[in-house]
């Protein structure tokens, strides 16, 4: 399945929107830095495209879920959030089309299921951190920075998959 060129542009727009969402000076937030343990190995180049797309889909779905909460709506600019949702929704659609195309071709590898679980656990850690920090502005900024980094890393994987073909 070939992801459309617009998918890459959408990924870049998503990162731009995340950058624009920033609301406070970040230097005072250093003490809230946290190791969320992004499962980078699950986005390694050893995977085939068919195995990677469901993992990328899970990643974007979890980002969507994280920023769709009541607490998130209170933390960020509504207009930017709406644009952000639109971009994520479009990327989910692109990836879902690929997942559907891949159904029935091969059995779902166990490796892929483990990777999806690792992504879910990563987002559980982020959610728990926000809860522990009482959804403070700094905690949200730390999470935004983390999502920018992890989303960027997963986007880079998409690009490397495309260039390999």
């Amino acid at each position: 399945c070939d992801l459309p060129q617009t998918h890459s542009l959408g990924s870049r727009r998503t990162l731009m929107l995340l950058a624009q969402m920033r609301r406070i000076s970040l230097f005072s937030c250093l003490k809230d830095r946290h190791d969320f343990g992004f499962p980078q190995e699950e986005f390694g180049n050893q995977f085939q495209k068919a195995e990677t797309i469901p993992v990328l889909h899970e990643m974007i779905q979890q980002i969507f879920n994280l920023f769709s909460t009541k607490d998130s709506s209170a933390a960020w600019d509504e207009t930017l959030l709406d644009k952000f949702y639109t971009e994520l929704y479009q990327q989910l659609n692109d990836l879902e089309a690929c997942v559907i195309q891949g159904v029935g071709v091969t059995e779902t590898p166990l490796m892929k299921e483990d990777s999806i679980l690792a992504v879910r656990k990563y987002f559980q850690r982020i959610t728990l951190y926000l809860k522990e920090k009482k959804y403070s502005p700094c905690a949200w900024e730390v999470v935004r920075a983390e999502i920018m980094r992890s989303f960027s890393l997963s986007t880079n994987l998409q690009e490397s998959l495309r260039s390999k073909e």
Epitope: A19, L26, L30, K31, D32, R33, R149, S152
Partner: antibody
Framework: EVQLVQSGAEVKKPGESLKISCKGS????????IGWVRQMPGKGLEWMGI????????AYSPSFQGQVTISADKSISTAYLQWSSLKASDTAMYYC??????????????WGQGTLVTVSS | DIQMTQSPSSLSASVGDRVTITCRAS???????LNWYQQKPGKAPKLLIY???SLQSGVPSRFSGSGSGTDFTLTISSLQPEDFATYYC?????????FGQGTKVEIK
């Protein structure tokens, strides 16, 4: 390959102005902060301040607040450190280094080669 | 501001020795964001350890970091000729970021 390349050595007179630069390459310049560190001859490292090139937000050490200005031009991936009126006590080696911001990643993992500033009448 | 105090200020050691440098913060670094750097004369500092105990990529495993709260340690398990340098700790917990005064490791 990640690189921070600083401008060359400067010899200035007291009261003169100066702007030194630090050009980043091999990474997304706006995804990292740039910090500036002073090292006076035979002395230790002193943190001067930091800039987020994505929006030019800055933070300074109280010791350097009002003494220097940190700026950045993200269009050319360059950070700057400037003085409006140099003093003999500004004679030092100045380093820039990249910082991961709020990410849990190595602090100051790449450094520029340093710019030696000599202020003498 | 968080003050960082290193000890000793200098030490003499031989190749193969185990070397320990300590760094004490004036207040607790609650997320343990304490970094260690090595600097050789005429060169820029080089990151060795970040977040108290994480070894920076490409740094030999003879270097290790430990500690939490206010007390941190850099250990060189078996000193090599290229390890003679000045070592600095730095807290990344809050601005202003601050460095220790340095520990010079010299040849005995």
């Amino acid at each position: 390959e990640v690189q921070l390349v600083q401008s060359g050595a400067e010899v200035k007179k007291p009261g003169e102005s100066l702007k030194i630069s630090c050009k980043g390459s091999g990474y997304s310049f706006t995804s990292y902060w740039i910090g500036w560190v002073r090292q006076m001859p035979g002395k230790g490292l002193e943190w001067m301040g930091i800039i987020d090139p994505s929006d030019s937000d800055t933070a300074y050490s109280p010791s350097f607040q009002g003494q220097v200005t940190i700026s950045a031009d993200k269009s050319i991936s360059t950070a700057y450190l400037q003085w409006s009126s140099l003093k003999a006590s500004d004679t030092a080696m100045y380093y820039c280094a990249r910082h991961p911001g709020l990410n849990w990643a190595p602090d100051f993992d790449y450094w520029g080669q340093g710019t030696l500033v000599t202020v003498s009448s | 501001d968080i003050q960082m105090t290193q000890s000793p200020s200098s030490l003499s050691a031989s190749v193969g020795d185990r070397v320990t440098i300590t760094c004490r913060a004036s207040q607790s670094i609650r997320n343990n964001y304490l970094n260690w750097y090595q600097q050789k004369p005429g060169k820029a500092p080089k990151l060795l350890i970040y977040a108290a105990s994480s070894l920076q990529s490409g740094v030999p495993s003879r270097f290790s970091g430990s500690g939490s709260g206010t007390d941190f340690t850099l250990t060189i398990s078996s000193l090599q000729p290229e390890d003679f340098a000045t070592y600095y700790c730095q807290q990344g917990y809050d601005t202003p970021l601050t460095f220790g005064q340095g520990t010079k490791v010299e040849i005995k």
